[in-house]
């Protein structure tokens, strides 16, 4: 697994260098979820041919995963700081049920799925901690989640090896469109 | 193997438009973490950045020439435009686009096009 | 916007020597810098990026460091085909903005 953010040889290298800030701590997050994301993708792309599969037969998967579109505040045009924030938060809380999906989908990389999980938590707090307008942010029912992740598990081995595929592309873009975004803030 | 070329006229009078075309290969502008930009330089001077557009179609300019520009991307022919209105001879420049590719955002520009040298005069 | 400032703006060294150039951000943009070679009639090209690392294909006689504000490219044992100007990039947030550049001249 890659390590942690805050103690990469960068930090060592520079004891002088002052504590991170609060949007250092999150850039720095996202890039060590990144990591992950990339250590599983390569798993999942050796494991099956799901990564060159074309874009139309995945856009036929009827996963509701979350995606960033101009409305949301999060793109240049119509940028508006608030809005996105709430938008990456509430984003990410709906990822959880799909990276709790993803838990017992690999082998040699199980602990890299589990410090994905576990990270993004963290960021979510991360990023809880920036928003101003929390009781915009909406949670995730646990029913509907639980019933999900029953569905999904019991899909056959094909459509769980394309629902691995697709979680782990569509989190990579939200994260970078997120990465982006925070960026600009 | 990636490669951008740049296209477009070498002589535009001013207050005229400026449209330039960057042709890609090698790379899809639909894969995340995927931008094009385009950068100028005018003769002996430094380089400046222009615009930029993303996989999903984020656009990002010069704020002191947003006014004049626009940038659009056709996914399936491999192309990026840029438009840039009433141009004037302080636009005389040698035009690039580059493509950014990571999965991290570091916005650095791995393959350039070979340029193109607009004049602007009348 | 951040304002990038490269130091010198043109320097003179021999072939084998090692040289150092600067590039200051007007605002911390912690690891988020990158550097390019472009020489006289060509495109630049990326040499590192996110302040030290070497882009594939880059000698490893290229090193870069820094972070926040202050940032350096060192070339050891300076090739012919060193010769060229230098750029720093901000690559934290839009607008992308680059260093009037340092030339190098090789003797």
């Known amino acids: 697994a890659p390590v942690p953010p805050g103690e990469d040889s960068k930090d060592v290298a520079a004891p002088h260098r002052q504590p991170l800030t609060s949007s250092e701590r999150i850039d720095k997050q996202i890039r060590y979820i990144l990591d992950g994301i990339s250590a599983l993708r390569k798993e999942t792309c050796n494991k099956s041919n799901m990564c060159e599969s074309s874009k139309e037969a995945l856009a036929e998967n009827n996963l509701n995963l979350p995606k960033m579109a101009e409305k949301d505040g999060c793109f240049q045009s119509g940028f508006n700081e608030e809005t996105c924030l709430v938008k990456i938060i509430t984003g990410l809380l709906e990822f959880e049920v799909y990276l709790e999906y993803l838990q017992n989908r690999f082998e040699s990389s199980e602990e890299q799925a589990r410090a994905v999980q576990m990270s993004t938590k963290v960021l979510i707090q991360f990023l809880q901690k920036k928003a101003k307008n929390l009781d915009a942010i909406t949670t995730p029912d646990p029913t509907t989640n639980a019933s999900l992740l029953t569905k999904l598990q019991a899909q056959n081995q094909w459509l769980q090896d394309m629902t691995t595929h697709l979680i782990l592309r569509s989190f990579k873009e939200f994260l970078q469109s997120s990465l982006r975004a925070l960026r600009q803030m | 193997q990636v490669t951008l070329k740049e296209s477009g006229p070498t002589l535009v009078k001013p207050t005229q438009t400026l449209t330039l075309t960057c042709s890609f290969s090698?790379?899809?502008?639909?894969?995340?973490?995927?931008?094009v930009g385009w950068v100028r330089q005018p003769p002996g001077k430094a380089l400046e950045w222009l615009a930029f557009i993303w996989w999903d179609d984020d656009k990002y300019y010069s704020p002191s020439l947003e006014s004049r520009l626009t940038i659009t991307k056709d996914t399936s022919k491999n192309q990026v435009v840029l438009t840039m209105t009433n141009m004037d001879p302080v636009d005389t420049a040698t035009y690039y686009c580059?493509?950014?590719?990571?999965?991290?955002?570091?916005?650095?520009?791995?393959?350039w096009g070979q340029g193109t040298l607009v004049t602007v005069s009348s | 916007d951040i304002q990038m400032t490269q130091s010198p703006s043109s320097l003179s060294a021999f072939v084998g020597d090692g040289v150092t150039m600067t590039c200051w951000a007007s605002q911390s943009i912690n690891d988020y810098l990158n550097w390019y070679h472009q020489r006289p009639g060509e495109a630049p090209e990326l040499l590192v990026f996110?302040?030290?690392n070497l882009q594939i294909g880059v000698p490893s006689r290229f090193r870069g460091s820094g972070s926040e504000t202050y940032f350096t490219l060192t070339i050891n044992s300076l090739q012919p085909e060193d010769s060229g100007t230098y750029f720093c990039?901000?690559?934290?947030?839009?607008?992308?903005?680059f260093g009037g550049g340092t030339k190098l001249e090789i003797k």
């Open positions: 580059a493509r950014s590719a990571d999965d991290y955002l570091y916005y650095s520009f791995d393959t």
């Open positions: 990039q901000n690559a934290h947030s839009f607008p992308l903005t």
């Open positions: 090698g790379f899809s502008l639909s894969t995340s973490g995927v931008g």
């Open positions: 996110a302040a030290s």
